[in-house]
Interface confidence: low
Amino acid sequence: DAHKSEVAHRFKDLGEENFKALVLIAFAQYLQQCPFEDHVKLVNEVTEFAKTCVADESAENCDKSLHTLFGDKLCTVATLRETYGEMADCCAKQEPERNECFLQHKDDNPNLPRLVRPEVDVMCTAFHDNEETFLKKYLYEIARRHPYFYAPELLFFAKRYKAAFTECCQAADKAACLLPKLDELRDEGKASSAKQRLKCASLQKFGERAFKAWAVARLSQRFPKAEFAEVSKLVTDLTKVHTECCHGDLLECADDRADLAKYICENQDSISSKLKECCEKPLLEKSHCIAEVENDEMPADLPSLAADFVESKDVCKNYAEAKDVFLGMFLYEYARRHPDYSVVLLLRLAKTYETTLEKCCAAADPHECYAKVFDEFKPLVEEPQNLIKQNCELFEQLGEYKFQNALLVRYTKKVPQVSTPTLVEVSRNLGKVGSKCCKHPEAKRMPCAEDYLSVVLNQLCVLHEKTPVSDRVTKCCTESLVNRRPCFSALEVDETYVPKEFNAETFTFHADICTLSEKERQIKKQTALVELVKHKPKATKEQLKAVMDDFAAFVEKCCKADDKETCFAEEGKKLVAASQAALGL
């Protein structure tokens, strides 16, 4: 339905509080370097303007699109050229090119200082002094560091953040109450950001069809009792929501997500028996709950898949009549029967089925040609099953830290050109698949592991895209969305790599390592491990293990010493010399 004023429409639908929060998120995701105060000023100006449009939709400029209004506002920032360089050129363009230009300049790895958590008392004082500013600052800091964070979900995180401070700042032991909650929010937030980044990459790099295929598979697993028409409707609506959020249209996205949650809850009888509890919650919690809801039970009376998709003599006729609908039905059918498969595996099977039909429906005897198509699925299913089995065994044998180290070595040898911080971050996250998924029974391992790995490898792809250094990474990232993980798994040691020059400074450590948290200390050691492999890519596991064990002992010894700095200086030189000898550097 057409509205005279889009900004008034969204303000009325969302309410002032959500409107302001979403505009702040949008602006912070576009202008990631701007100070908080500047953004707040811009948001207040937009909000006041929106209120005038609510009062009179015919007022001047109220008929302009949100892109035009927001883009005009962003382009008033005085320091645009010196802060953002060529991004300022976007302001010379007209909509929709201007918005596209802003989107292209979103930075997945902005040069921003690490967020340091103040003392609990300091945070509680700030919260009590000005709760509104405190929460806005949270939205701003997360949004600018995660420019693709799913905006309506960030509102949910902010609500939980507020609840944590409201509860814990009154507690007897504030820190014991608050810190675990903040850790949980941080970890969940990083995971949520990474999952959304994959959705946006899927839409932006591989198109709407790829996203819709992913959504059909996932929703069919989740709602196996829903009919195809119902799943198709949900997929269409969900695609619209994510296209809007990934495109920076956060007001429309949040509004449409709320509508989708409403529709799902009004029609839960024909969607899933697991939605009841979700649908009793308030809006933000409801939407989050629906997005995370467990898979419904599979219907008991599903007929054989082969009847419709292999044995039928009309397969080619049905395929030719409506290719995407027929493939969609195949994907729906297969996915609802296989909650034990990863979404990416289901998409590989659908792709194989499509390729077979393309070939066979042009053959002399199509039925004879595609009769054995399901046999082609077997190796595709077994590959991730075997990989997960092997890696879970390795994880159970080594534990998370050493499993991460094994992956660090593996991936550094595959793509040694990638920057050390990226290799450490990605390999650490890849390694978390063990504790996240290996505890699950077999039926849940593959969807947990392979779909999680897709999210992590997408982080590698978006970070690498910013400064491409490896043709192998580019190839695996761009050729096929669903085959990224098998592509990286298949990479062997890069024989073309010229080992990095040895630099003693890289392996020089100081007493400050002793005051670091266990996690930070691990990262230091893992950074050193990546550098070792870059210097000596042909080093064996045993050689690397020996050097790392020596390194751990060296850190432990010097952190116990009275004169730590001297110990690090003297023992460090010995360690470097011993390591060079051990690795033949």
Partner: antibody
Framework: ELQLVESGGGLVQPGGSLRVSCAAS????????MNWVRQAPGKGLEWVSG????????YYADSVKGRFTISRDNAKNTLYLQMNSLKPEDTALYYC?????????????WGQGTQVTVSS | SYELTQSPSVSVALRQTAKITCGGD??????AHWYQQKPGQAPVLVIY???NRPSGIPERFSGSNSGNTATLTVSGAQAEDEADYYC???????????FGGGTHLTVL
Amino acid sequence: ELQLVESGGGLVQPGGSLRVSCAASGFTFSHYYMNWVRQAPGKGLEWVSGINTGGGTTYYADSVKGRFTISRDNAKNTLYLQMNSLKPEDTALYYCAKGGIVAVGGFGSWGQGTQVTVSS
Amino acid sequence: SYELTQSPSVSVALRQTAKITCGGDNIGSKNAHWYQQKPGQAPVLVIYKDSNRPSGIPERFSGSNSGNTATLTVSGAQAEDEADYYCQVWDSSANAAVFGGGTHLTVL
């Protein structure tokens, strides 16, 4: 409003043929499995045949296999049942019933039926 | 082929609870659907997928399904509930729908 209207029933001699139709409206016909269910006078319900959404896969009760053919025309929103080699025991009220998207049952909507009588 | 067994008749006093059963080998592993049919009318789906009520069906109708028995329960039976009731499942091994023989519910 969802409607299923059967037609084409009548009196036919044993060994004869008849084609009954079901005109559908008020829903996206091409998205749903469709079925024929019959009820002999004073007896219970008996499922006769089902057809998938595209029309490419058909299902039959053992009692009619080889004699009856179910088909559909999605462009016309119409379901058909071609009955050949009819027997007196095929005498029944024939209902058209809307199934699901993939699982054939349950049958959420029914027509009012068309009477088929096989008698000499 | 798969068979469903229903007792031919069940009686219930007005406003009391009636239970109509449908027996089948491991029927609990299949989705059971229930239909109500009044004289001279087409059947109406009253319960689908074991225990789900279509919109417009009174709350007094409920269903359950486990083991070898599916059950349709009419709590607080009304005079208008007097009808024939049929259970139905899909037999995936034969790729065919199967109906029970039907139960006539009498409301006294």
